[in-house]
């Protein structure tokens, strides 16, 4: 199988993971997209997904995960706010394209969250950020219940990923949790 590349993000508790997953806009603009976690020896699990069809720039929030799909740009933005040590793991962006298997975007993200004070509270960006608010009205989309005939013994090819039921979305926080993100200059 093709070796999948990983991009390591090392962040502190309380910071925000902010990932931009690019896609070919002519092909995938309105396709449903998802953010998944891959645990050792398990199928990827869907934590959050966009609506179907995906709505342009419309934020979808599941707990501390926010997805924004920018059709005009061919870009899916994924944010995980108020990171916790237990969020550490391997993640990926995928595009659902039934009946085919999902198409993986970008490199996989190896997230390492450590304890300790973060120099840039609430974000992995630098101090250029002077306004940062979680949108007050977001939607929780229902993710498809995909299964794959392939058993996971090795990494799948670069362009595909396996998906299973999105039962892990509650592992981060309940959707009703209050999210506090500092506004700073």
């Amino acid at each position: 199988a093709t070796k999948l590349t990983e991009e390591k993000y090392e962040l502190k508790e309380g910071q925000t993971l902010d990932v931009k997953c690019d896609y070919t806009l002519e092909k995938f603009a309105s396709s449903q997209k998802a953010w998944q976690i891959i645990r050792d020896g398990e199928m990827p699990k869907t934590l959050a997904c966009t609506e179907r069809p995906s709505k342009n720039s419309h934020p979808v929030q599941v707990g501390r995960i926010i997805l924004e799909d920018y059709h005009d740009h061919g870009l899916l933005r994924v944010r995980m706010v108020n990171l916790q040590v237990e969020d550490s793991g391997l993640y990926q962006c995928v595009i659902y394209q039934p009946p085919k298997e999902p198409h993986m975007l970008f490199d996989r993200i190896r997230l390492v969250v450590t304890k300790g004070f973060s120099g840039t509270p609430g974000s992995n960006e630098n101090s250029t950020q002077n306004v940062y608010k979680i949108p007050p009205t977001t939607t929780k989309a229902l993710c498809p219940l995909y299964t794959s005939p392939r058993t996971v013994t090795q990494a799948p090819p670069k362009s595909t990923a396996d998906v299973s039921t999105p039962d892990s979305e509650i592992n981060l926080t309940n959707v009703t949790d209050i999210i506090r993100v500092p506004v700073f200059n």
Epitope: D72, H73, E125
Partner: antibody, heavy 116, light 107 residues
Framework: EVQLVESGGGLVQPGGSLRLSCAAS????????MSWVRQAPGKGLDWVAS????????YYVDAVKGRFTISRDNAKNSLHLQMNSLRAEDTAVYYC?????????WGQGTLVTVSS | EIVMTQSPATLSVSPGERATLSCRAS??????LAWYQQKSGQAPRLLIY???IRATGIPARFSGSGSGTEFTLTISSLQSEDFAVYYC?????????FGGGTKVEIK
Amino acid sequence: EVQLVESGGGLVQPGGSLRLSCAASGFTFSSNWMSWVRQAPGKGLDWVASIKQDASEIYYVDAVKGRFTISRDNAKNSLHLQMNSLRAEDTAVYYCVRGGWRFESWGQGTLVTVSS
Amino acid sequence: EIVMTQSPATLSVSPGERATLSCRASQSVSSNLAWYQQKSGQAPRLLIYGASIRATGIPARFSGSGSGTEFTLTISSLQSEDFAVYYCQQYKNFPLTFGGGTKVEIK
């Protein structure tokens, strides 16, 4: 067709102010991040600032922080850059661009000259 | 701040030949890299995003590759309209940063 038309450039003395505007058409302005990018004469490109659709996120390059303010009016499809305490090194063509991270569409630019 | 370095500063190529432009990031930018073309007296134009995805309307002779810190823009067969300055730009993190540019000139 996407159109971005900048205005408001000109000659200003050091320490002075200018307000640049950008009229956008041909796309759904309110669904797009917008940015300003500048280019000093004979030099390369420099990102200046970006603003989210609802202005809930705004970013600036350190060199202009505290002096420049990016804003938008979605009702009028317009983007603005208020530039205060201008310096000679701010002399550049300022481009209005569609996008907040990478830039799909560019205006033709407006020249800002800071000189005494 | 992520520093983007382009090489060479100037590339002299004959029409019909292949041109290879390099861009290096001071730290990994994953695939969050774009390439722009700027002709004299004109605004830049987006060519490639996501390191390898051609923007709408860009001819197939333009291709991008790379990930992490090393990226390449290849123009397979230079046409007269391709002589211009090319910039790379990272968008993994703010502040967004551009390379210094590579001027592709007629040999």
